[in-house]
């Protein structure tokens, strides 16, 4: 239970006072205010919004609100030389061109500075050649093409449908397959829900709608020119040839009307199975090239975007802690959008704004949190999590010593079905306890708790009567805090009932149609889901900043470590002969997990019994909890991914959005049967088991009695 003893404040100022102050109507008003014009990173409009937020946070009562600026590599289309893709005939004449911009939504026809759809950081180029359809361009899709179908993508332009995995992974896979260009498109199978009208009459993607997005493979580096260090005034910048994560081939996104024109003429091989077919009226032939009558026609890309070092601005607000001002609980979400940002990010930014307002109201009445709360409005998230990463790089020494927790606050909704939470196991009990105290906004669950509706609609696959909580992956601003610095992190939002479509996003994601009206008309007219998300995010921050003992349960880490060890062992056991031949043993890992479990259990017992009135002991126990996440950090990082340093979790090497457990071992085992030197490959597996076992054991020891 949360307690206010140490903060010397009136009983009125408890969690309930904070939660009661949050209002749906305010979130609605803030969302409207944040979505009337585009706020693309690096633009004057986004700088003005940063200054507005700074001013309002000060008015709300924060102790200080500063802008933190960095000069980072961004990418923009050429205003006078638009990007497009053509079908050309044998004479080189363009017989079809993809659209130059999206048809604007009603009411926004005269808005200027709507950036046309583009793939941020695509190099310039005008490749032409035959088309190959590569499904989602996942690792397994290229395996199917190259190994089973014997189709060579070398020198071809590949067309891939969005969805399932992060677009940057698609581009990386295409590059490795030898493609000379990539076309990304949204298939109605993934971005058009049956029975729903397209925008502006519903929340589905129209044929002219296009998903923007960056196509970097940064692996946590931040600004591509200053990996590991802040992009400040005296930064040393790499040359563009040495920049981290930039794609080497032109890439461009299109909508399904344009995709129809490219795909309807495809010839070559038939799709290998039904999982390669979308919902367009086309054969989904793989190619290469066009069929019969059209075999002399080619596809040509015209990409003229430029990479530019541009100033970005984070807004950092501080609410100083009364008792432990040197312990930081951070609530952060981004401000920059591709266009209007109706959902991404402003549905999150509006919630953060209301949380700040509520905390400010309490502060004006004389209350302070026990620990310091930092609020952040990050810039350039859409360009590779740049604002948050640069700030964390600049403040890494403070953060690694003082960072208690990071709560992310991007889009508050991606649907209106149920809650979705991804977090460190340390926060499981916090989330469970909090959601039991909150009212469910769901129809049919009036008078019931959020925990109850969430558990009913999204049950845990392992534990009955509990809700699903997922692993943290990446693709958002928690990345640097969790994966690089080892600060306990979590995120929460309302989601859809599309478990199969987990990583495709909502239909209008990153399109011009992501407007205020989309949210107000179709997703959350009463803003009740936004309010619930504000209560969850704000409630987590409140508890993390105010509870005397940190609301972390290390026993939950023990449980998942065992689960992850079992999982990785079973993957390895698909190769029993090799494990025997190369003497591969997981004994050290299972032993370490057993030790962790026992030590965590004893620590939890001590946590119940220690004298909480002794500030030294209290601080000691809290520090052990705070530093537990940090203990899973390997300073050397993962192989070829130095900024992914968490040994238990990393973004999947095949999908940045997804989290992978024991990623070092997982990657060493992946496709091991195809490795040219099995002895070396299995040696790396053994090394990764050693690193994982050591790290788990070392983390366990941080929970042992100190002397």
């Amino acid at each position: 239970k949360s307690s206010n003893e140490a903060t010397n404040i009136t009983p009125k100022h408890n969690m309930k006072a904070f939660l009661d102050e949050l209002k749906a109507e305010n979130i609605k008003k803030f969302l409207y205010n944040f979505t009337q014009i585009p706020h693309l990173a690096g633009t004057e409009q986004n700088f003005q919004l940063a200054k507005q937020i700074q001013s309002q946070w000060k008015e709300f009562g924060l102790d200080s609100v500063e802008l933190a600026h960095y000069d980072v590599l961004l990418s923009y289309p050429n205003k006078t030389h638009p990007n497009y893709i053509s079908i050309i005939n044998e004479d080189g004449n363009e017989i079809f061109n993809t659209s130059l911009f999206e048809p604007p939504p009603p009411g926004y026809e005269n808005v200027s500075d709507i950036v046309p759809p583009f793939s941020a950081f695509s190099p310039q180029g005008m490749p032409e050649g035959d088309l190959v359809y590569v499904n989602y361009a996942r690792t397994e899709d290229f395996f199917k093409l190259e190994r089973d179908m014997k189709i060579n993508c070398s020198g071809k332009i590949v067309i891939a449908r969005y969805g399932k995995v992060f677009r940057g992974n698609k581009v990386k896979n295409a590059q490795l397959a030898g493609a000379k260009g990539v076309i990304l498109y949204s298939d109605p199978a993934d971005y058009f829900a049956p029975g729903v009208k397209s925008y502006p009459d519903g929340w589905n993607l129209p044929g002219g709608g296009v998903q923007r997005g960056n196509i970097l493979n940064l692996n946590g580096a931040g600004d591509p020119l200053t990996p590991g260090y802040p992009a400040n005034e005296y930064a040393y910048r790499r040359g563009i040839a040495e920049a981290v994560g930039l794609p080497s081939i032109p890439v461009h996104p299109i909508g399904y009307y344009d995709a129809q024109k490219l795909l309807e003429k495809m010839g070559g091989s038939a799709p290998p199975d039904s999982s390669w077919r979308g919902s367009l009226k086309v054969p989904y032939n793989v190619g290469p090239g066009f069929t019969g009558n059209f075999s002399t026609q080619k596809v040509k890309m015209h990409i003229h975007s430029t990479n530019e070092v541009t100033r970005i601005y984070n807004v950092i607000g501080t609410l100083r802690g009364a008792v432990e001002p040197d312990r930081y609980v951070i609530l952060g979400g981004h401000r920059d959008s591709w266009v209007f940002g109706g959902i991404d990010p402003q549905s999150g930014a509006a919630v953060v704004h209301e949380i700040v307002r509520s905390f400010g109201t309490l502060k004006k009445e004389g209350w302070r949190p026990r620990r310091t709360i930092l609020f952040a409005s990050w810039d350039a998230e859409e360009f590779g999590l740049l604002g948050s990463t640069e700030w964390a790089e600049e403040n890494s020494r403070l953060l690694q010593e003082r960072g208690v927790a990071y709560i992310n606050a991007d889009s508050s909704i991606e649907g209106n079905y149920t809650l979705r939470v991804d977090c460190t196991p340390l926060m499981y009990s916090l989330v469970h306890n909090l959601t039991k105290e909150l009212k469910s906004p769901d129809e049919g669950f009036e008078g019931k708790s959020l925990y109850e509706s969430w558990t009913k609609k999204s049950p845990s696959p392992e534990f009955s009567g509990m809700p699903r909580i997922s692993k943290l992956g990446s693709g958002n601003d928690f990345e640097v805090f969790f994966q690089r610095l080892g600060i306990a992190s979590g995120r929460a939002r309302y989601t859809k009932n599309w478990e199969t479509n987990k990583f495709s996003g909502y239909p209008l994601y990153h399109s011009v149609y992501e407007t205020y009206e989309l949210v107000e008309k179709f997703y959350d007219p009463m803003f009740k889901y936004h309010l619930t998300v504000a209560q969850v995010r704000g409630g987590m921050v409140f508890e993390l900043a105010n509870s005397i003992v940190l609301p972390f349960d290390c026993r939950d880490y023990a449980v998942v470590l065992r689960k992850y060890a079992d999982k990785i062992y079973s993957i390895s056991m698909k190769h029993p002969q090799e494990m025997k031949t190369y003497s591969v043993s997981f004994d050290s890992l299972f032993s370490a997990v057993k030790n962790f479990t026992e030590i965590a259990s004893k620590f939890s017992e001590r946590l119940q019994d220690f004298d909480k009135s002794n500030p030294i002991v209290l601080r000691m126990m809290n520090d052990q909890l705070m530093f537990l996440e940090r203990a899973f950090i390997d300073p050397l990082g993962l192989p070829d991914r130095p900024f992914y340093r968490h040994v238990i979790y990393a973004p999947s090497s095949h999908n940045k959005y997804a989290g992978e457990s024991f990623p070092g071992i997982y990657d060493a085992l992946f496709d091991i049967e195809s490795k040219v030197d099995p002895s070396k490959a299995w040696g790396e597996v053994k090394r990764q088991i050693y690193v994982a076992a050591f790290t788990v054991q070392a983390a366990a020891e941080t929970l042992s009695e100190v002397a």
């Epitope: 497009y84 017989i95 079809f96 061109n97 993809t98 659209s99 130059l100 911009f101 048809p103 604007p104 009603p106 026809e109 109605p188 044929g207 002219g208 399904y256 009307y257 344009d258 129809q260 024109k261 367009l280 009226k281 009558n293």
Partner: antibody
Framework: EVQLVESGGGVVQPGRSLRLSCAAS????????MHWVRQAPGKGLEWVAV????????YYADSVKGRFTISRDNSKNTLYLQMNSLRAEDTAVYYC??????????????????WGQGTTVTVSS | QSVLTQPPSVSGAPGQRVTISCTGS?????????VHWYQHLPGTAPKLLIY???NRPSGVPDRFSGSKSGTSASLAITGLQAEDETDYYC???????????FGGGTKLTVL
């Protein structure tokens, strides 16, 4: 009320030029493809040209290719047909028409759902 | 010579049913491109009657229906009325011409 109003027709000598305009109102012009269609005296309808909403694509009937240019000014909600090197066989009533929204394709690959009343072009010496 | 072939004229008595055919080829109707039908009284704006082979815009009576099969399409009018006497055109897209094509038109006479 959705409306298309053509103007700019008239009598012109062979080899000369003429520019037709079509003013659109009552709908979001910038989001629609637009066509020109003509009807010569005593003949049927003949498609002339089409332009996509963003001018990324323009297509012409073989009979006018290289002589006619379709364009649009989305800020003025106006469609144009610039007709050069006019011939006697270009004599017709010229209609502008809005492309029809339907199916899994750009509207300009579909039919035409809203038509203007037409403007008459006579090419005669 | 139109790419889409229609009969020059058809006729029927009031209350009767008439059909107007529209025959194309493998590069237009047969290539799965939609067929649209228009009613045109000379000197006025043509009116969309049927779109996407068989769909009626709002305001068009259900006496008008369209169908498509293979390389041809047809327009059926039931319960003929005097005001139906005018010209009817079919239209589709032709991939070999990269253009939009009309039939030559059919004059409907209500006897």
């Amino acid at each position: 009320e959705v409306q298309l109003v053509e103007s700019g027709g008239g009598v012109v000598q062979p080899g000369r030029s003429l520019r037709l305009s079509c003013a659109a109102s009552g709908f979001t012009f910038i989001t629609y493809g637009m066509h020109w269609v003509r009807q010569a005296p005593g003949k049927g309808l003949e498609w002339v040209a089409v332009v996509s909403f963003d001018e990324s694509n323009k297509y012409y009937a073989d009979s006018v290719k290289g002589r006619f240019t379709i364009s649009r000014d989305n800020s003025k909600n106006t469609l144009y047909l610039q007709m050069n090197s006019l011939r006697a066989e270009d004599t017709a009533v010229y209609y502008c028409a809005r492309a029809l929204r339907d199916g899994n394709n750009w509207d300009y690959f579909n039919g035409m759902d809203v038509w203007g009343q037409g403007t008459t072009v006579t090419v005669s010496s | 010579q139109s790419v889409l072939t229609q009969p020059p004229s058809v006729s029927g008595a009031p209350g009767q049913r008439v059909t107007i055919s529209c025959t194309g080829s493998s590069s237009n109707i047969g290539a799965d491109y939609d067929v649209h039908w228009y009613q045109h009284l000379p000197g006025t704006a043509p009116k969309l009657l049927i779109y996407g082979n068989s769909n009626r815009p709002s305001g068009v009576p259900d006496r008008f229906s369209g169908s498509k099969s293979g390389t041809s399409a047809s327009l059926a009018i039931t319960g003929l009325q005097a005001e139906d006497e005018t010209d009817y055109y079919c239209q589709s897209y032709d991939s070999s011409l990269s253009g939009w094509v009309f039939g030559g038109g059919t004059k409907l006479t209500v006897l």
